[in-house]
């Protein structure tokens, strides 16, 4: 007669994490007498997965009905699969004895677990940088299996090419992590820009995961200053304005200096936003010319986002007629409080 064979028809089985895995096993004979057991791995360190007699195997159920006579189907189902369940499973026939002895093993079924990568987390530099500088962004995703994965970087929909990616560990593992670093050159128009890390994996069925970083959290656009002088109705008064243009973020403090002495300090509040996300602001001084015998040097000094101050000066000539100095085009500005100097 033919000797009993243990048949594991599936060389490999791939299951998504959280699902159940069915591991098939049939025997060709009811004899010799003795139990079937399932193990993960081979050799002395193998792990018992199911034994009908002793042990507690809450995630394992037998596929054949518990009342089936002359059963030769010893398939099992393992519920709630996790990446830690990956490995090769063996259906093993034992010969009854004291103790039972291994009679024959199936060829094994390799269980691979498809685990989705975690949502990519994109992080930028700790400190803000100014346009023309190159900054690094990192993207991390964890817990995926199998190891094959594709990562792409985009800036405003345009694919980036300057990046380096590592998948760890290099060898076999139950699950993997990906880490990528991309270099991005900032421009003045990047306040509204986004950097996107896109991860594609077999478990995502063509719908990649994305992580984003807003460059508004990374960029600092320093302001440009312009100080101008316009006459006002009263013949002895001039309005001096400081136009602070194209800055980001909004955090800005302006100080007026009169001949080097602090005249007024104020914080940008009512700003106007440009289409590119940067801000404009204007502050003015109302200067009483008749109170001065000598020329006055007015300085607009701006401290932006904690950076060293930048300034722009304007020489107010008291001998000249006010109406001949500067232009009268500041009507649109909603600047700050007026200040008279006497």
């Amino acid at each position: 007669e033919e000797e009993l064979q243990v048949i594991q028809p599936d060389k490999s089985v791939s299951v998504a994490a959280g699902e159940s895995a069915i591991l098939h096993c049939t025997v060709t004979s009811l004899i010799p007498v003795g139990p079937i057991q399932w193990f993960r791995g081979a050799g002395p360190a193998r792990e018992l997965i199911y034994n009908q007699k002793e042990g507690h195997f809450p995630r394992v159920t037998t596929v054949s009905e518990s009342t089936k006579r002359e059963n030769m189907d010893f398939s099992i189902s393992i519920s709630n699969i996790t990446p830690a369940d990956a490995g090769t499973y063996y259906c093993v026939k034992f010969r009854k004895g004291s103790p039972d002895t291994e009679f024959k093993s199936g060829a094994g079924t390799e269980l691979s677990v498809r685990a989705k990568p975690s949502a990519p987390v994109v992080s930028g530099p700790a400190a803000r940088a100014t346009p023309q500088h190159t900054v690094s962004f990192t993207c991390e995703s964890h817990g995926f299996s199998p190891r094959d994965i594709t990562l792409k970087w985009f800036k405003n929909g345009n694919e980036l090419s300057d990046f380096q990616t590592n998948v760890d560990p290099v060898g076999e593992s139950v699950s993997y992590s990906i880490h990528s670093t991309a270099k991005v050159v900032l421009t003045r128009e990047d306040v509204h820009s986004q950097v996107i890390c896109e991860v594609a994996h077999v478990t995502l069925q063509g719908d990649p995961l994305r992580g984003t970083a807003n460059l508004s959290e990374t960029i600092r656009v320093p302001p440009t200053l312009e100080v101008t002088q316009q006459p006002v109705r009263a013949e002895n008064q001039v309005n001096v304005t400081c136009q602070v243009r194209k800055f980001y973020p909004q955090r800005l403090q302006l100080t007026w200096l009169e001949n080097g002495n602090v005249s007024r300090t104020e914080t940008a509040s009512t700003v106007t936003e440009n289409k590119d996300g940067t801000y404009n602001w204007m502050s003015w001084l109302l200067v009483n010319v008749s109170a001065h015998r000598d020329d006055v040097k007015l300085t607009c000094q701006v401290e932006h986002d904690g950076q060293p101050a930048v300034s722009k000066s304007h020489d107010l000539k008291v001998s000249a007629h006010p109406k001949e100095q500067g232009s009268n085009t500041a009507a649109e500005n909603t600047g700050s409080n007026e200040r008279n100097i006497y």
Partner: antibody, heavy 119, light 108 residues
Amino acid sequence: VQLLESGGGVVQPGGSLRLSCAASGFSFSNFAMTWVRQAPGEGLEWVSTIGSGDTYYADSVKGRFTISRDNSKNTLYLQMNSLRAEDTAVYYCAKDSTVSWSGDFFDYWGLGTLVTVSS
Amino acid sequence: EIVLTQSPATLSVSPGERATFSCRASQNVKNDLAWYQQRPGQAPRLLIYAARIRETGIPERFSGSGSGTEFTLTITSLQSEDFAVYYCQQYYDWPPFTFGGGTKVEIK
């Protein structure tokens, strides 16, 4: 399924007997087979089971009885040596059955053959 | 070895009445228990396996229950052919297969 025992009789203590069980109506070589005995007025006692090459014995008969099978003849045997008075019983041949992953029970029995060990 | 204890040893019942008898195992045998009927002068006959599954051809008046260490065989309405000896057998841990001492059901 039919199981028919033969070979019983009267034998002196220390003597030998060979019981046979002719099986029909099922695929004999695919199943384990068992001998169960019942002393007069007593309950059932398992004696021995054979699978393919694997054999199992009750402690009370180990070393004295030998179970064997000839699949070509669909026949089960029990060679009984060094017989004792306490071996006196009706010997039943039974076909093993299993359910799912569990052990064996006996779904078909022969009519039995009486073995009497007496001087 | 697992010891099976059947009680009562003898049960006197009138035809048509219900008969219930038990089999207690010395250790957990899960559901690996069978019941046999032996009429006088006949070979045993399988009635129940896996503690509760009726063998093909066995009347519905026979039912098995229990698991672990406590098992019961119930005959709902005794017929004349049901007066016999009933044995339980465990096949959870062997060798040896062990049988209970039997319960004799006799006519009251």
